[in-house]
Every structure is written in C-alpha cells, then in structure tokens.
C-alpha cells in the first residue's frame, strides 16, 4: 500500500492489498476501498469503463468479462488500482477485433488474458500460416499484443492471439489487420483531354483520374481564378491493395461563352499535391480559319509541278471541301486529311497537286470548305512562267521592223545589228516604239509585247536580230539586209531559239 507523509492527502487503500488478483469463474469478487474521502470505483477492460459509487465492489458470480482494472478514486483525485483476472478455461481471451494499423506505427491487438499463468502468449497466423518474418510484437497480458512498426505488407493479415494452456495451444477469435498506408508520394493525376472546344449550349464533360495508395486522397475540380463550387461526380475502384483509382467527372450541361477558361484537377495527400489542367473554349458559333502554307500568288515554270497547300481550322468538323479552277471542280489531284489523329484535333490539311503545268493553265485556283455553321474560301493566283515566243516579225510598209513576242513574265525585246557576215550581233539598236498589247486581256495569260525599230538607220549589208527574253528563256528572230543600188530589201527573216 502507498505510504505518504502526515498532513498530505494520501491515495485510498484497497483490500485485498495486492496489485493483481486471480479468481476463478463463478467465484465472488469482493474489493474494499478505504478512504475518508471515497468517491468512486471504476472498472476498465478493453478501454471500456463502468463506475460504482459504493466503497465495496461486489460481484457475486465472476465471469471472464469481469477481468480488468479496478480503480478506487478519492475526492483529492488520488487513486489506487488492482487488476483482477477471472480465470475461465473456456474464455482465455477478451477481444475487440477492430484492428487498424497505420503504416510505420505500432498497433495493439486487443486480446487481454483472463489467466496470467498461461504461457507463450503470442501471435499466430490463421490457418497455420506463418507470420511475416519481420513482424515484431510485444505481449502484455492486461492489454493485448502490440505489433511494432506496421508494414504495408501486413494489410489484411489474419491473426490469432495464442497461448499454451496445459501443453495445448489455444487460439483467440481471428483478427484481420487493416493497414492504413502512409503517403510516400504525391497522387498521380491525369485528364481525359487537355483541351475542349464547344459551341454554346453543348455539354462540357471532362474526367480526371486520380491514383493513390488509398481512398484518403483528396481531389477536386477547380476553376482557375474562381472560388465557384463545381459539380462533380465520382467513380472509384480499389485495384487490389494500395492501388486506388478515382474518376472525378466535371460536367457543365449547357456551356456558355463565359464558361471558357482553364479548369484544374487538384489532388493532395499528406505527402504533397499534384494537379493537371484542361482548357475549355466555348464559341457562340462554329468557325473556319484558313491558313495558306504557300504564298497565295504562285509562279511556276512551264512544265513543272506545284502543290497548293492549305491548313485550316474547322469547328465543328468540315463537311464539304472542294478545289475549283475556271468554274470547274477537281474530282481528283487533291487530298484532304486531319493534321493530327488526336481526338480534339480541329486542324486539317488540303493539298491540290498540279502537275506539268502548261502556259494556258495559269489562273485562280480556289479552295472552298464548309461545316454546319460557316463557309470559307481561299484563292491562289497561279502564274505559269513561259519562255518568250516570237509571234510575228515583219518589215512594215513605213519601213519599220516590228517584232511581237509573248511570254510570262512579260518579255523584254532587244534589237541588235550585225554588219556583214559577222555572227555575233553586239551593237544594240534602240527601239522606236514598245507596247504591251494585251494588258486588258485575261490576267493570267502570256503577256504580248510589240517592239519596232526604224530600218532606215541601217546603211550596210547585215543582219538585224530581234531578241525576246524573260526569266525563263530567250528567243531570237533575224532580218537579213542586202543593198542593191540604193534599195534595201529584207531577205529571209528567220528565228533562232537560244536556250
């Protein structure tokens, strides 16, 4: 019994005066608390308590469930305790089978004994299975068995408390350990699509997938720069232990333009947080934007190939595409395809393949595209570069020499005089008149140039060269002159192609 110095309040005294008492099932428990300031008896087992205001605690026929700690308390708050074991061979353990363990922490298997004199108080696996090799425990007959540093691998471990009684192993009811994992990484979050494009009134629905070790992970959809509570629906699955998946679906049943913005799926646990975003763009009506991939004015050499390429954004998806030239629709020679196979793709490519173009095939080539909301078009002006062709070369009645050439770009005509029999005509002659003839004609055809010189300027026999040229090539025509007396006459005009 406790001893204190006189004058100081002392704890109550209990009879019988021992710390532990063993009684047999069916026997009487009689405990007397002696204290001038007696307040109450408290009985506690498996962390449950009962009180008694009588100073003598009497249980006429003891049962195993009367096993526990009996505490007498006085008015000074001082107390004294005795632990009573009610030995019942048929009920060696008192149990509370709720068994939760937090990873890396200790947890108590609550199976206190009713008989302290049994031996080998320990834990055993169910169905004769061994316990994990690294499982360590500390038995306490009055409380149960403490498992040290719970591991994730112990989740749903089936256990019995076990003792040896008269040489036989006796097992308690089964305990199933539920381990709450410690978060050792941030949640993994992903979103069904990174961006959405909708028309007003259409439904916006996006799903965020959150993966973590347990359902304790927190997740929410947030609108960036907004505190508005968003409506979400959840589905969740446990794919085995510590592999939890949640799908959080955000829905706006009828999207409006002002719903456009960035939506964040945010998840956190005690280790940290993670997020992923998706962008919503709501337009009042559909659109088509066309982007030429080459200049819309195209120059191509005669006989060469050219590809007219456009990229275009179309929402909703394009329904009709066509290429047109001179009011005729191409049935082949073109292809149209999405820029990406991505589900959210709105960008497309259209290519018209023009092969071995002739000088007569210049003109306006138009790409037209439409969807359910809008039409759009883009025109390419195609110019076919052709080397000059000398259409006419004549000596006119007024004594002028005239050369007419056609080509694209517009040819330049130069005149040269070669005295006598020289092959090289280097002396240039200035034209009297130069005209572009068909500027009022079709815009993409060859350009026709007329140039004239005065033949009276030539006093000797020789050859006059009319040379028409542009970026593509050159062509020449020749006038041969011979003087017979005072008369000059033109002999054998002929052309000579010079590449």
């Amino acid at each position: 019994q406790p001893s204190v110095s006189p004058g100081e309040p002392s704890p109550p005294s209990i009879h019988p005066g021992k710390s532990d008492l063993i009684v047999r099932v069916g026997d009487e428990i009689r405990l007397l608390c002696t204290d001038p300031g007696f307040v109450k008896w408290t009985f506690e087992i498996l962390d449950e308590t009962n009180e008694n205001k009588q100073n003598e605690w009497i249980t006429e026929k003891a049962e195993a469930t009367n096993t526990g700690k009996y505490t007498c308390t006085n008015k000074h708050g001082l107390s004294n305790s005795i632990y009573v074991f009610v030995r019942d061979p048929a009920k060696l353990f008192l149990v509370d089978r709720s068994l939760y363990g937090k990873e890396d922490n200790d947890t108590l298997v609550r199976c206190p004994l009713t008989d302290p004199e049994v031996t080998n108080y320990s834990l055993k696996g169910c169905q004769g299975k061994p316990l994990p090799k690294d499982l360590r425990f500390i038995p306490d007959p009055k409380a149960g068995i403490m498992i040290k540093s719970v591991k994730r691998a112990y989740h749903r471990l089936c256990l019995h408390c076990s003792v040896d009684q008269e040489g036989k192993s006796v097992l308690s009811e089964k305990f199933i350990l539920k381990v709450r994992p410690a978060f050792k990484a941030v949640p993994v979050v992903s979103v069904s699509k990174a961006s959405y494009l909708l028309r007003e009134g259409e439904e916006f629905t996006v799903t965020c997938t959150i993966k973590d070790v347990s359902s304790s992970v927190y997740s929410t959809w947030k609108r960036e720069n907004s505190q508005t509570k968003l409506q979400e629906k959840y589905n969740s699955w446990h794919h085995g232990d510590f592999n939890y998946e949640r799908q959080a679906t955000l829905t706006i049943s009828s999207a409006r333009v002002n719903d456009s913005g960035v939506f964040m799926c945010y998840a956190n646990n005690t280790f940290g947080s993670a997020n992923v975003t998706t962008t919503l763009e709501v337009v009042d009506k559909g659109f088509i934007n066309i982007f030429p991939m080459i200049n819309t004015t195209v120059f191509v050499n005669d006989g060469e190939n050219v590809d007219l390429i456009v990229e275009y954004e179309a929402f909703p998806k394009p329904e009709h595409q066509q290429w047109i030239y001179m009011n005729r629709t191409f049935t082949d020679k073109w292809e149209d395809y999405p820029k990406s196979e991505n589900e959210s793709n709105i960008r497309y490519v259209s290519e018209l393949h023009l092969t071995r173009l002739k000088g007569t095939e210049g003109g306006t080539y138009t790409f037209l595209v439409s969807n359910s909301d809008v039409n759009a078009a883009i025109a390419f002006n195609v110019y076919v570069n052709t080397k000059p062709e000398i259409l006419t070369y004549d000596r006119l009645v007024n004594g002028m020499l005239q050369c007419v050439a056609a080509g694209f770009p517009e040819p330049t005509i130069d005149w040269y005089f070669c005295p006598g029999t020289e092959q090289r005509c280097s002396a240039s002659v200035l034209p009297v008149d130069v005209q572009t003839l068909n500027s009022s004609g079709p815009p993409f055809g060859k350009l026709v140039v007329q140039s004239s010189i005065d033949s009276s300027a030539f006093k000797h026999n020789g050859t006059v060269e009319c040379k028409a040229y542009n970026d593509v090539g050159k062509t020449s025509a020749y006038f041969n002159f011979a003087f017979k007396g005072n008369n000059k006459e033109q002999i054998h005009p002929h052309t000579l192609f010079t590449p």
């Epitope: 962390d47 308590t49 709720s98 089936c158 199933i176 709450r180 005690t270």
Partner: antibody, heavy 117, light 111 residues
Framework: QVQLVQSGAEVKKPGASVKVSCKAS????????MHWVRQAPGQGLEWMGV????????SYNQKFKGRVTMTTDTSTSTAYMELRSLTSDDTAVYYC??????????WGQGTLVTVSA | EIVLTQSPSSLSASVGDRVTITCRAS??????????MHWYQQKPGKAPKLLIY???NLESGVPSRFSGSGSGTDFTLTISSLQPEDFATYYC?????????FGQGTKLEIK
C-alpha cells in the same frame, strides 16, 4: 456504460458552416475510432468518414471531401464534425458512432441540421 | 466503392410471421472467411441499433429471433417470429473497405 451525447439541433443558411459535437463517456476515448453517419429526411444512412484512434488521422467519404473536417478534443473526450458550404441537400440528422469490435456498436442520439434560406 | 442492394425495399407482414431480408454486395466483403457485413435496425426518430455483426453474430441484448447468414456477396437477415416492436427499417452495412457503405434500407410494415 458507453454513452455518446450529441449537440442540439441547428438551423443554418446556405453557404454557412455547422460544427456538431459528440461527447463520449464510459470508455477510453483515444482508444476507439469515431465515425460520422448522416441521414437526410426519409432517406437511408450515408457514411461520412472516420477519425481514427491513436494518431487522430482521418478518412473521409470523397463525397464530402473539401467540406468536412473531423477533429477530437481528448481533454473533454469530444469528437467534432464540421461541414462547410452548406446547401439544402445537407439537411439531415448527423450521427456519431463508435466502432467497437469491427462494428458500429454505439451511436449518438443524432443532431438535426436544417439548411434553409 | 462497394454498393449494397437490399431487397425488398419495403415489406408488409404480420406479427408471428417469419421474415427474410436480403443484401447483395457488388463485390465480396469477405477477408479470410470473415464477412465484414452488419445489420442495423432503425425506428423513426431514433439512432440505428446494431443487431447482427460479422454476418452472423448476434449483438449482446438482441433477441434470438434475429439471425444473420451469408458470405461473400449475398447476405440474409431473418426474423423468425415477428413481434410488434420489430416494425422498423433495417439496413445492412459493410466495412470491408472505405468508403463504408449502407444498403438503401428495407421498411418492414404491419400488414
């Protein structure tokens, strides 16, 4: 004997918060998990979450995540459940329940929370 | 989450009748042969009261006319002979894994 006594009925405006208390007696408060369950008028029972014994960590039903917080005051053996951003859908009777031997062996008497403009 | 579906949703019976209520889980609630399924009784304006725990164990103080059976996904609550005080709503509940879930309830009425 074990008793769970809850705080009285509350009337709240939409958008407000409510904090329901559950005072425990008859057992060692820190040794048992405390769960919260609610029941809307004429409806069934819905588990809201649990505050575990020992470390006092919590696990919430995702439906209430971000709005619910469960705490304890061990000095008074009282558990608390706070629910924020209330709407009319949160009108319900809220119960605390002690988990004992794998089941909800003890329940509080319930606290009616009415959310009304 | 594990979804519990009770049937019937409501039931009319007379005093002395034998009544059976079933509860089906969307997945097994068993761990090592232990079924984490419980049954509760609730009367209007009162808190639920535990009747049966771990599928078949009678809670202390509950009359023996109540019994539970089943394992895995299919469970049954049986009242062998209805008494007037048994007219109430009955719920099954699983705590194999979180979130813990309840059945939608079976209302037992007097015929």
């Amino acid at each position: 004997q074990v008793q769970l006594v809850q705080s009285g009925a509350e009337v709240k405006k939409p958008g407000a918060s409510v904090k329901v208390s559950c005072k425990a007696s008859g057992y060692t408060f820190t040794s048992y998990n405390m769960h919260w369950v609610r029941q809307a008028p004429g409806q069934g029972l819905e588990w809201m979450g649990v505050i575990y014994s020992g470390q006092g960590d919590t696990s919430y039903n995702q439906k209430f995540k971000g709005r619910v917080t469960m705490t304890t005051d061990t000095s008074t053996s009282t558990a608390y459940m706070e629910l924020r951003s209330l709407t009319s859908d949160d009108t319900a009777v809220y119960y605390c329940a002690r988990e004992r031997d794998t089941r909800f062996g003890n329940w509080g008497q319930g606290t009616l929370v009415t959310v009304s403009a | 989450e594990i979804v519990l579906t009770q049937s019937p949703s409501s039931l009319s019976a007379s005093v002395g009748d034998r009544v059976t209520i079933t509860c089906r889980a969307s997945e097994s609630v068993d761990i090592y042969g232990e079924s984490f399924m419980h049954w509760y009784q609730q009367k209007p304006g009162k808190a639920p009261k535990l009747l049966i725990y771990l599928a078949s164990n009678l809670e202390s103080g509950v009359p023996s006319r109540f019994s539970g059976s089943g394992s895995g996904t299919d469970f049954t609550l049986t009242i062998s002979s209805l008494q007037p005080e048994d007219f109430a709503t009955y719920y099954c509940q699983q705590n194999k894994e979180e979130p813990y879930t309840f059945g939608q309830g079976t209302k037992l009425e007097i015929k």
